[in-house]
């Protein structure tokens, strides 16, 4: 008698490893013999698909080599024209040993920045990822974390983070190890010991000592009055990433000596500087009783900043005031090359008007200091970040020279415009066009960790300048 199909063994969930065989059985009783079709995720499996084998009148479906993409719901449908078609479904779960699809790579990173070592994995069950540093499992902490993706993130990279790393992916089916990669931590050049200023007699020998560190170990060069040192002998030694340089000089004239430590990070360089003055005792005696005299500015550095034929105060505590003051400006000016384009013109105006102060002629020639309000505007508006860096260096004793005592005035000690309009000098050239003034460098509440002044931020400043203010 005709009999409608009945599935006697319903399909079950099948677990299979990648590249292994997986079989679904769909036993059917019926008369006449049914026609059996198979679907995966509701899509018909074609009889001639070579990845599958269908046997026993369609009752056995075999996947010949399981792939990662084969997981899904498999259904068999039996129909013989008697009664309705019947269906049974089961799932294929593809199990997979861990596999590292994006292994970590060697990384060079600057101290203080964030490092991410990738380690993307595949596997079912999903592998857990851990990391090994050297020969020991890596412990996570507030700086070091293994991300959801398996990648290793290290915040505020420290020297001690340098070393060999590998990631380990593990699930119930096995373990995979990445190749060993190297994390190299580079450190900006930093001066540990600055050269000291000396006041000596003519013809003395003086040794200037400068010690610096960094990774890679920096090189040290010496600059005399803005040029490469032409005389004197230099001795250097390197030990434990610290370079020690000694410059021995035979003193015949006063000078400003700068120790420059430089190291390379990829295509970029980092530089640290410290300066010392060598003065000759007999030369520093003040001439007569007054401390200086008025004269027209005849130098070059401040030509564009000071008014034409400006009367400036020349300080006779220097043997050659014009040359000495020009040298101070020149050296400080060179340092301004690294500051932001917003800060630089303002700082140059401040510097020139501070070192070559306006002079009030009279029985006793008197220098006219910059007005406090102008100093504050340069300090807090134009050069907020750079000023913090300079003040920090001054406090740390990296600037021993007269140059920095002179070039960074203490605004609070300057006279106010309100006291006597003629008692202080106003700075010209504190204006900018619309393009330069999109934003000012933000005021920072803490001192920068890296002694490299930042360019103006493009985000809206935390100082009270609105990027939306109108200038018409």
């Amino acid at each position: 008698l005709p009999k409608a199909p009945v599935i006697t063994t319903p399909l079950e969930t099948v677990d299979a490893l990648v590249e292994e065989v997986a079989t679904f059985m769909c036993a059917v009783e019926s008369y006449p013999q049914p026609e059996i079709s198979w679907t995966r995720n509701k899509i018909l499996i074609k009889l001639f698909d070579t990845r599958y084998s269908i046997r026993e009148n369609g009752q056995l479906l075999t996947i010949l080599s399981v792939e990662d993409s084969d997981d899904g719901i498999y259904c068999c449908t039996a129909n013989n024209g008697v009664g309705g078609a019947v269906e049974s479904c089961g799932a294929l779960q593809v199990k997979m040993k861990p596999k590292i699809t994006r292994p970590p790579i060697n990384v060079k990173i600057i101290e203080g920045l964030k490092a991410v070592l990738p380690c993307t994995t595949m596997g079912n069950p999903k592998p857990s990822v851990s990391w090994i540093k050297g020969d020991s499992p890596l412990r996570e902490n507030s700086r070091i974390a293994v991300l959801e993706s398996g990648s290793l993130r290290i915040h505020n990279v420290q020297k001690e983070d340098a070393g060999q790393y590998r990631c380990v992916a593990k699930n119930s089916l096995g373990t995979a190890y990445s190749k060993v990669v190297k994390l190299e931590v580079e450190v900006f050049a930093r001066i540990l010991r600055a050269p000291e200023s000396h006041n000596v007699t003519f013809g003395s020998f003086v040794t200037l000592h400068c010690t610096a560190t960094g990774i890679p170990v920096p090189t040290i060069t010496w600059i005399e009055n803005g040029n490469a040192v032409s005389s004197g002998s230099i001795q250097e030694s390197v030990k434990d990433r610290v370079i020690d340089s000694r410059l021995q000089l035979f003193i015949t004239k006063p000078g400003l000596y700068t120790c420059i430590a430089t190291n390379k990070h990829g295509e970029k360089f980092s530089t640290a500087k410290a300066a010392a003055t060598i003065s000759i005792a007999e030369w520093s005696k003040p001439q007569k009783d007054n401390k200086g005299y008025c004269a027209q500015y005849r130098g070059e550095v401040c030509n564009a900043v000071l008014a034409k034929d400006a009367l400036v105060f020349l300080n006779t505590s220097y043997a050659d005031p014009e040359e000495a003051q020009e040298l101070l400006v020149h050296t400080a000016w060179n340092e301004l090359k690294v500051v932001s384009p917003v800060c630089r013109p303002a700082a140059e105006a401040l510097l020139c008007n501070h070192i070559f102060q306006e002079c009030s002629p009279g029985v006793v020639p008197t220098p006219i200091p910059i007005c406090r309000e102008y100093c504050l505007a340069v300090k807090e508006l134009f050069c907020a970040k750079e000023w913090l860096v300079m003040e920090e260096k001054t406090h740390r004793g990296l600037y021993r020279s007269e140059m920095h005592l002179l070039s960074v005035p203490e605004c609070s000690k300057l006279p106010s415009m309100h006291w006597d309009p003629t008692a202080c000098a106003r700075l010209p050239h504190l204006d900018y066009n619309k393009e330069n003034l999109k934003t000012f460098p933000p005021m920072t509440s803490s001192k920068p960790s890296v002694d490299i002044p930042n360019l103006p931020s493009s985000s809206s400043s935390s100082f009270s300048v609105s990027p939306t203010y109108s200038m018409t």
């Epitope: 007005c371 309000e373 508006l381 920072t444 300048v465």
Partner: antibody
């Protein structure tokens, strides 16, 4: 002696216009910054607009932007506030004040001289 | 925009009292902060500029100070003529904001 004298206030209907003047003496407008500050009846001080005529730069409070225009005539040593599309909430005593220096420095020197104020009433 | 939150909004004090008025900036600002005194029907008068500098002609009992984003006006010994409303004001380049004012009344 430094002096600022405002004029031009009065009663105006909503949507109307007024032009306030601030005549300065004892200093030059070109070397200072001029500000307009208003005070609604029984309320606090509210900054309206500023001009630094040496740079020809101006700035406005959001509440008046697009409606008010600040300007200065250095030959007359006078600053102006042109007020258009006036609203009831613009009713206030309008003071002009000066501070020494350009737009960067003026904030540090404070508004040291103020006019006596002129009353603007916007009402239908 | 930067807000200057002034406190208290009013206070009662006696002659000879030490009075302190505070302004807190909503974010980091420069020292371009001034304090003014205003009496009814009169224009404001400048007392302090650059956060802590005493304006010429202002009695030395008035002083200004700064601590981070907090700016303080102190009257060391209140005098009868000091009963008035006091305002703080901060300046950007330019975005000027005033505090809401503190009225100092006789106790």
């Amino acid at each position: 002696e430094v002096q600022l004298v405002e004029s031009g206030g009065g009663l105006v209907q909503p949507g109307g216009s007024l032009r306030l003047s601030c005549a300065a003496s004892g200093f030059t407008v070109s070397s200072s910054s001029i500000h307009w500050v208003r005070q609604a009846p029984g309320k606090g001080l509210e900054w309206v607009a500023s001009i630094s005529s040496s740079y020809g730069s101006t700035s406005y409070a959001d509440s008046v932007k697009g409606r008010f225009t600040i300007s200065a005539d250095t030959s007359k040593n006078t600053a102006y506030l042109q007020m258009n599309s006036l609203r009831a909430e613009d009713t206030a005593v309008y003071y002009c004040a000066r501070s020494e220096g350009d737009r960067y420095v003026s904030g540090y020197s404070g508004m040291d001289y103020w006019g006596q104020g002129t009353l603007v009433t916007v009402s239908s | 925009d930067i807000q200057m939150t002034q406190s208290p909004s009013s206070l009662s004090a006696s002659v000879g009292d030490r009075v302190t008025i505070t302004c807190r900036a909503s974010q980091s600002v420069s020292s371009a902060v001034a304090w003014y005194q205003q009496k009814p029907g009169k224009a404001p008068k400048l007392l302090i500029y650059s956060a802590s500098s005493l304006y010429s002609g202002v009695p030395s009992r008035f002083s200004g100070s700064r601590s981070g984003t907090d700016f303080t006006l102190t009257i060391s010994s209140l005098q009868p003529e000091d009963f008035a409303t006091y305002y703080c004001q901060q300046s950007g380049v330019w975005l000027i904001t005033f505090g809401q004012g503190t009225k100092v009344e006789i106790k």
